[in-house]
């Protein structure tokens, strides 16, 4: 994976989400869960601090179906 000490912001973040999520597409925020009243967005999680592949993949959209 990428160097974990580095953060991903702007175009770097969009590039990486596009490559990792591929056909699934991606979101910049996830729905709030019962555990957390406020969902942290990917900018907060990956731009303000470093994030790994597993975290990035949680922002991939649910797989779509073929036409």
């Amino acid at each position: 994976a990428y160097r974990p000490s580095e953060t991903l912001c702007g175009g770097e973040l969009v590039d990486t989400l596009q490559f990792v999520c591929g056909d699934r597409g991606f979101y910049f925020s996830r729905p709030a869960s019962r555990v957390s009243r406020r969902s942290r967005g990917i900018v907060e999680e990956c731009c303000f601090r470093s994030c790994d592949l597993a975290l990035l993949e949680t922002y991939c959209a649910t797989p779509a179906k073929s036409e």
């Epitope: 994976a1 990428y2 770097e12 596009q18 591929g22 056909d23 797989p63 073929s66 036409e67």
Partner: antibody
């Protein structure tokens, strides 16, 4: 028109190193993430490495992690693949590629052949 | 990783006849993408999003399928279609290709 031209391939002994280059033209190189894909002789296609447009994010297939390093110089419109500790199974044609969303691996260079042999 | 399995490995078809290539994914994928590779050339994007023709691709090529099973069809084989065809999935990281299907003229 997108043009990608690879160079740097050749015959190398196991354990040695090689650096591949890919010169890009016909598009705004610094706006695009890039990848390397390889093809062993008579075999299928295998994604090798990814680098984001600014170079801050890189990913590798498991078999090359720790041995290969992808990098780029946006001022020279050039992509690189530094290959260390080469193995016989790394023998392949190496292609540099880029994508538009949904048009995955849409643009390819002609490839450069790397042969790892003693 | 999702494993892509193409069948058959090779097929020989008479000029003007139909050629059908199958691609099966080890897990469900959103879409399938197909590439054509002629001898000594890099692969070329042929079909994206399961069924959409890439620019300049003749309409004798078509793609279909969903879930884990997808098909590339050449409705009337032409001499210039002799090539190896690969499927690709981009629904799961990392991207994975099928092993290829060689199409020849009978």
């Amino acid at each position: 028109e997108v043009q990608l031209v690879e160079s740097g391939g050749g015959v190398v002994q196991p354990g040695r190193s090689l650096r591949l280059s890919c010169a890009a033209s016909g598009f705004t190189f610094s706006n695009y993430y890039m990848t390397w894909v390889r093809q062993a002789p008579g075999k299928g296609l295998e994604w090798v490495a990814y680098i984001s447009s600014g170079g801050g994010s890189t990913y590798y297939r498991d078999s090359v992690k720790g041995r290969f390093t992808i990098s780029r110089d946006n001022s020279k419109n050039t992509l690189y693949l530094q290959m260390n500790s080469l193995r016989a199974e790394d023998t392949a044609v190496y292609y540099c590629t880029t994508e538009d969303y949904g048009y995955w691996f849409a643009y390819w260079g002609q490839g450069t052949l790397v042969t790892v042999s003693s | 990783d999702i494993v892509m399995t193409q069948s058959p490995d090779s097929l020989a078809v008479s000029l003007g006849e139909r050629a059908t290539i199958n691609c099966r994914a080890s897990s469900s994928v959103s879409y399938m993408h197909w590439y054509q590779q002629k001898p000594g050339q890099p692969p070329k994007l042929l079909i994206y999003g399961t069924s959409k023709l890439a620019s300049g691709v003749p309409d004798r090529f078509s793609g279909s399928g969903s879930g884990t099973d997808f098909t590339l069809t050449i409705s009337s084989l032409q001499a210039e279609d002799v090539a190896v065809y690969y499927c690709l999935q981009r629904s799961s990281y990392p991207p994975t290709f099928g092993q290829g299907t060689k199409v020849e003229i009978k």
